[in-house]
Interface confidence: medium
């Protein structure tokens, strides 16, 4: 029989032959034979994998390093990851949470409507038509666009809510 | 190495202005939001104010709004208070401070004192 060129869900593709992928949490020994099925173990502790897998090594659960205000939300097994979250009153400084900051900053777009306090975190608010942000900031609010016609120009470019307006020179008409 | 220097304090009357200033130095004074605080005699530190990184934005604690106003220099790297209608409860060592995202203030300076007084 001609040998396959593509194999069913949960298969791949080796030595012209269709081998059946290592189940999630476990790592690949072996590739399978015309005789032998493929050869799997499971991954050892602190080790995951989280898909149907042609892989030799298993992942490394993600550390939560309590130097960086992290802490264990949810522990790992042998099909997830560690999932990491911050300290009491810290913050995620993304959504994988790597590290914690102790007040949250507002991304470029958005601004500060309230800054943080002992209590509360940073309060952030996306900038209204007019108003742009072009950092990422504990403090900063959003800021105006500039008024190109105070200063008798005309706009350029139209401003967004990460971007300040772009004013030029008018065009005069010539004689 | 990060510095702070506070300079511009002194006795003054009640009523009566000054300006206090903080040369900084060792860090990207241009991208860091930077506060004043302040410790009268025998208390704890107290929040006065916050400057934004582009001065744009700047907050106020409820006890001086209204008399006080922080601004920056950024080609001088500077920070400055204007301090005015001056109380004696306005009596204080003055300390300006450093935005880390990580730990929130950090870096002061040695402080400039402040005394109001007739």
């Known amino acids: 029989p001609e040998p396959p060129t593509a194999c069913r869900e949960k298969q791949y593709l080796i030595n012209s032959q269709c081998c059946s992928l290592c189940q999630p949490g476990q790592k690949l020994v072996s590739d399978c034979t015309e005789f032998t099925e493929t050869e799997c173990l499971p991954c050892g502790e602190s080790e995951f994998l989280d898909t149907w897998n042609r892989e030799t090594h298993c992942h490394q659960h993600k550390y939560c390093d309590p130097n960086l205000g992290l802490r264990v939300q949810q522990k790992g097994t042998s099909e997830t990851d560690t999932i990491c979250t911050c300290e009491e009153g810290w913050h995620c400084t993304s959504e994988a949470c790597e590290s914690c900051v102790l007040h949250r900053s507002c991304s470029p777009g958005f601004g500060v409507k309230q800054i943080a306090t002992g209590v509360s975190d940073t309060i952030c608010e996306p900038c209204p038509v007019g108003f742009f942000s072009n950092v990422s900031s504990a403090f900063e609010k959003c800021h105006p666009w500039t008024s190109c016609e105070t200063k008798d120009l005309v706009v350029q470019q139209a401003g967004t809510n990460k971007t300040d307006v772009v004013c030029g020179p008018q065009d005069r008409l010539r004689a | 190495e990060v510095q702070l220097l506070e300079s511009g304090g002194g006795l003054v009357q009640p009523g009566g202005s000054l300006r206090l200033s903080c040369a900084a130095s060792?860090?990207?004074?241009?991208?860091?939001?930077m506060e004043w605080a302040r410790q009268a005699p025998g208390k704890g530190l107290e929040w006065v104010s916050t400057?934004?990184?582009?001065?744009?934005?700047?907050y106020y604690a409820d006890s001086v709004k209204g008399r006080f106003t922080i601004s920056r220099d950024n080609s001088k790297n500077t920070l400055y208070l204007q301090m005015n209608s001056l109380r004696a409860e306005d009596t204080a060592v003055y300390y300006c401070?450093?935005?880390?995202?990580?730990?929130?203030?950090?870096?002061w300076g040695q402080g400039t004192l402040v005394t109001v007084s007739s």
């Open positions: 401070a450093k935005w880390n995202s990580t730990t929130g203030f950090d870096y």
């Open positions: 060792g860090f990207t004074f241009s991208a860091t939001p």
């Open positions: 400057i934004s990184e582009s001065g744009y934005s700047t």
